[in-house]
């Protein structure tokens, strides 16, 4: 039975040209995390962090994506096209797959504040 829950940074905003940290956290389960996948807009793999093999940033994103902190992901040099949904998928044993969602809004305004709070989606 899947007892875990994913907490994420929820809805966040950041400045164009700036950076943002995407974070998910799996709690309330003893399951072993074998791999975490990060996806953009549900159809592009950004990065994978495999427990045994470490991090891989996919070629199309190598210039703008940095691994961490932890199992999170840092997006750099943000553009307006980066606005949208991001998904963390936790592959675990024996529970199976947990998935969290973050919505990022990239703002033109110089007064845009990076708001990040943990919430259960």
């Amino acid at each position: 039975m899947m007892t875990g829950t994913i907490e994420t940074t929820g809805n966040i905003s950041a400045k164009k040209g700036g950076s943002v940290i995407l974070q998910c956290h799996l709690s309330s389960t003893m399951a072993q995390v074998t791999q975490v996948n990060w996806e953009q807009h549900d159809h592009s793999l950004l990065a994978i962090r495999n427990a045994e093999l470490g991090w891989h940033i996919y070629p199309a994103f190598k210039d703008r994506v940095a691994p961490g902190p932890g199992l999170g992901l840092t997006l750099q040099s943000l553009t307006m096209n980066d606005t949208g949904e991001y998904f963390c998928t936790y592959h675990t044993y024996p529970d199976g797959t947990y998935r969290g969602r973050i919505f990022l809004e990239v703002l033109e305004s110089s007064v845009a504040e990076h708001s990040a709070r943990f919430q259960i989606p």
């Epitope: 996806e39 549900d42 159809h43 592009s44 793999l45 045994e52 093999l53 996919y58």
Partner: antibody, heavy 117, light 107 residues
Framework: EVQLVQSGAEVKKPGASVKVSCKAS????????IEWVRQAPGQRLEWMGV????????NYKEKFKGRVTITADKSSSTAYMELSSLRSEDTAVYYC??????????WGQGTTVTVSS | DIVMTQSPDSLAVSLGERATINCKAS??????VAWYQHKPGQSPKLLIY???YRYTGVPDRFSGSGSGTDFTLTISSLQAEDVAVYYC?????????FGGGTKVEIK
């Protein structure tokens, strides 16, 4: 030029072990994964496992756990795949491949392993 | 394990015509699909990764598309040297799994 050169064909008896080598050249050995894939006669390609030569970390397909061991020697830029308790169903061509993480951009020439009594 | 189902099993196409191969994943794999060409007596060769990115040196008649669970490899104008077996592979999660292969021949 990137090259992966594998050891020669092997004929083994059931219950025996086989160790296939894969010597890499033309790139930084520790910057890429080495994956092992096999193809039995008339079957699809089957991924067996992978090693990160830099860290030594490995990941195996569940069905091979306990029977396969993948190692890497950084000093000689060589990876090894040892499969034990061989059975007739292990008769196959065994490939090593360089992993651009989880897809495979260069492949060895293949090593035919025949298991027969 | 994620099951990759390819169709058709074989395909006969006239020279210069289009060949289309489909691959369906048993669960969501985002764009984590690669395509390989395998000729008899040779090692497999990477054509496409991340569903649609053509690997270095691969002719532009080869293209890939799809995301989620449904993927396609297209050879826009079949050449004699394209006769081979083509495999899809998911690189979304371990164990990495391959489709059953599609044999492409000249009609």
């Amino acid at each position: 030029e990137v090259q992966l050169v594998q050891s020669g064909a092997e004929v083994k008896k059931p219950g025996a072990s086989v160790k296939v080598s894969c010597k890499a050249s033309g790139y930084a050995f520790t910057n890429y994964l080495i994956e092992w894939v096999r193809q039995a006669p008339g079957q699809r390609l089957e991924w067996m496992g992978v090693i990160n030569p830099g860290s030594g970390g490995t990941n195996y397909k569940e069905k091979f756990k306990g029977r396969v061991t993948i190692t890497a020697d950084k000093s000689s830029s060589t990876a090894y795949m040892e499969l034990s308790s061989l059975r007739s169903e292990d008769t196959a061509v065994y490939y090593c491949a360089r992993g651009e993480y989880f897809f495979f951009d260069y492949w060895g020439q293949g090593t035919t392993v025949t298991v027969s009594s | 394990d994620i099951v990759m189902t390819q169709s058709p099993d074989s395909l006969a196409v006239s020279l210069g015509e289009r060949a289309t191969i489909n691959c369906k994943a048993s669960q969501h794999v985002s764009d984590g699909v690669a395509w390989y060409q395998h000729k008899p007596g040779q090692s497999p060769k990477l054509l496409i990764y991340s569903a649609s990115y053509r690997y270095t040196g691969v002719p532009d008649r080869f293209s890939g598309s799809g995301s989620g669970t449904d993927f396609t490899l297209t050879i826009s104008s079949l050449q004699a040297e394209d006769v081979a077996v083509y495999y899809c592979q998911q690189h979304y999660n371990t164990p990495h799994t391959f489709g059953g292969g599609t044999k492409v021949e000249i009609k």
